[in-house]
């Protein structure tokens, strides 16, 4: 401590205190007295900036008096005890309680010592995220929606994705006075490649220890995208059976597969088994264009494949896929 006559009593308090709407909060305020310094506190006073008069006073001989006795209470000050702790509890926090407060000690012989504290009135928001199910539009549309309800101050919403996309964020007053509901839409041109992918909504707020992450699984409805696999251009007479597969990606799932040829129905050597087509061994060369038609709730799409079965020694070639 400094030598006698150079020390000073100081008021210690945080510059800012957070409290939650409807809850109680303590505004801490203490008098720090150097070791050898004698001081006598006759009065503790709390006042709000911009308001005349005091909201709470604790007098050494008269005890406490409050502007709103049901909402205010000195936490530690007691009659007959040394007044070193002016901490004040506020009950039933309201939006209008937010502001600057002065905690003041009247000390003898040092005089008045005060400090200002900013009370922040917070409301913890509730967060939800949901998919916006879309069809192929060719235009940017909202594909995910993230809502932070009843926050004070408004929550900050950001989106994280490898897919690009643009946020569109808006605010409206919350249910409770002074609170805000923030809605953020994630906007992208829908494509089949995006279906089933994830985007993350990140919500940040003063009341959270860490940001809240909400994952949205994207849904894009699109008609089937069809291709046929299983043919390698090396099919020869006399070889075993082979299988062609009709590969279809769609949302919702395909409801039906229909195999045909450009000439009409399937020839005898081709047997349809749902998404697969069984090609039986043939004894003469063929050159046929096969068609797979896939249907889902949004429509039908087809793929064509020209298959040739040629003459030649099968042992020298990879040939048809064997079962």
């Amino acid at each position: 401590w400094p030598p006698p006559g150079t020390g000073d009593v100081v008021v210690q308090a945080p510059t800012q205190v957070p409290g939650f709407l409807g809850d109680s909060v303590t505004l801490p305020c203490y008098l720090q007295v150097p070791n050898m310094e004698v001081t006598h506190v006759s009065q503790l006073t709390w006042a709000r900036h911009g308001e005349s008069g005091s909201m709470a006073v604790f007098h050494q001989t008269q005890g406490p008096s409050y502007s709103e006795s049901k909402r205010l209470e000195f936490v530690a000050a007691r009659l007959g005890a040394e007044l070193r702790n002016a901490s004040l509890r506020m009950f039933g926090l309201r939006v209008e309680d937010e502001g600057n407060y002065t905690c003041l000690f009247v000390t003898f012989p040092q005089g008045s010592r005060s400090v200002d504290i900013w009370l922040r009135v917070l409301a913890k928001p509730q967060n939800t995220a949901e998919v916006q199910k879309v069809q192929l539009t060719g235009e940017p549309v909202p594909m995910a929606r993230c809502v932070s309800t009843g926050g004070r101050p408004p929550a900050q919403i950001t989106w994280h994705s490898d897919l690009g996309g643009m946020p569109n964020t808006s605010q409206v007053p919350g249910f409770l006075s002074g609170t805000v509901t923030v809605t953020s839409l994630w906007i992208l041109v829908p494509s089949s490649q995006v279906d089933g992918k994830n985007v993350t909504c990140k919500v940040e707020h003063e009341s959270f220890e860490k940001p809240q992450l909400l994952t949205v699984n994207l849904t894009v409805y699109y008609p089937p995208e069809v291709s046929i696999s299983g043919y390698d251009n090396n099919w020869y007479l006399g070889q075993n059976e082979a299988t062609l597969t009709c590969d279809a990606r769609s949302n919702p799932e395909p409801t039906g597969y229909n195999w045909s040829t450009t000439m009409g129905p399937l020839p005898p050597f081709a047997v349809a088994q749902g998404a697969q087509l069984l090609i039986r061994p043939v004894d003469k060369p063929i050159n046929t264009t096969l068609i797979c038609n896939v249907t889902n709730a949004l429509g039908a799409r087809q793929a064509e494949l020209t298959v040739q079965v040629k003459e030649g020694p099968p042992s020298e070639h990879s040939g048809i896929s064997r079962n």
């Epitope: 006559g5 150079t6 000073d8 004698v38 006759s42 050494q60 001989t61 007959g80 012989p109």
Partner: antibody, heavy 121, light 109 residues
Framework: QVQLVQSGAEVKKPGASVKVSCKAS????????ISWVRQAPGQGLEWIAW????????NYNQKFTGRVTMTTDTSTSTAYMELRSLRSDDTAVYYC??????????????WGQGTTVTVSS | QAVVTQEPSLTVSPGGTVTLTCRSS?????????ANWVQQKPGQAFRGLIG???NRAPGVPARFSGSLLGDKAALTLSGAQPEDEAEYYC?????????FGGGTKLTVL
């Protein structure tokens, strides 16, 4: 107006005690700090102690600790200073002074007229 | 204990300005000494002028002002009046006790 009226002059023998009174009027006595100060003949002013009238809390000059006691009687708005084991060098004019508050700092506001204490065998 | 030293006497002309100072034997006077100034006119009671270094007591004319001047406490009288002729005492706080200066006899001549 604010006034401090002290008791009359005292003549005491060495080793005796003296009790000087200081009656306050014109303000809220219980919210006040009162200091006692003395001035020996041909000497400067010397601070003895202060008391907070409302609670009786005191702070003494270490030089006088054990020999001086300050008290208040809130019913009569009177402060008292008792000095024991009197010596000849305690001969002085004893003053009570009320501390006033400007809203920022304290000052020695109003003084009593003084009480002459003579210690002589 | 600390010793508080003041000019034994000063003279000022009516309407003039004079500064009374107050030195501490322990070093520089600071705001933590809460310098007080009191006035005593002949045959009258003491009267408080300044508290807490620079806070003027109610009813004290604005021509009296308190401050710190270098390493000393100071009482400045601007525009001295004949009725300001008096003894002026400085009082300093030293953590747990007050110490009075020897006083300055101010003559307005």
């Amino acid at each position: 107006q604010v006034q401090l009226v002290q008791s009359g002059a005292e003549v005491k023998k060495p080793g005796a005690s003296v009790k000087v009174s200081c009656k306050a009027s014109g303000y809220t006595f219980t919210s006040s700090y009162i200091s006692w100060v003395r001035q020996a003949p041909g000497q400067g002013l010397e601070w003895i102690a202060w008391i907070y009238a409302g609670t009786g809390d005191t702070n003494y000059n270490q030089k006088f600790t054990g020999r001086v006691t300050m008290t208040t009687d809130t019913s009569t708005s009177t402060a008292y200073m008792e000095l024991r084991s009197l010596r000849s060098d305690d001969t002085a004019v004893y003053y009570c002074a009320r501390h006033g508050y400007t809203g920022r700092g304290w000052y020695f506001a109003v003084w009593g007229q003084g009480t002459t204490v003579t210690v002589s065998s | 204990q600390a010793v508080v030293t003041q000019e034994p006497s000063l003279t000022v002309s009516p309407g003039g300005t004079v500064t009374l100072t107050c030195r501490s034997s322990t070093g520089a006077v600071t705001t933590s000494n809460y310098a007080n100034w009191v006035q005593q006119k002949p045959g009258q009671a003491f009267r408080g002028l300044i508290g807490g270094t620079n806070n003027r007591a109610p009813g004290v004319p604005a021509r009296f002002s308190g401050s710190l001047l270098g390493d000393k406490a100071a009482l400045t009288l601007s525009g001295a009046q004949p009725e300001d002729e008096a003894e002026y005492y400085c009082i300093l706080w030293y953590s747990n006790h007050f110490v009075f200066g020897g006083g300055t006899k101010l003559t307005v001549l």
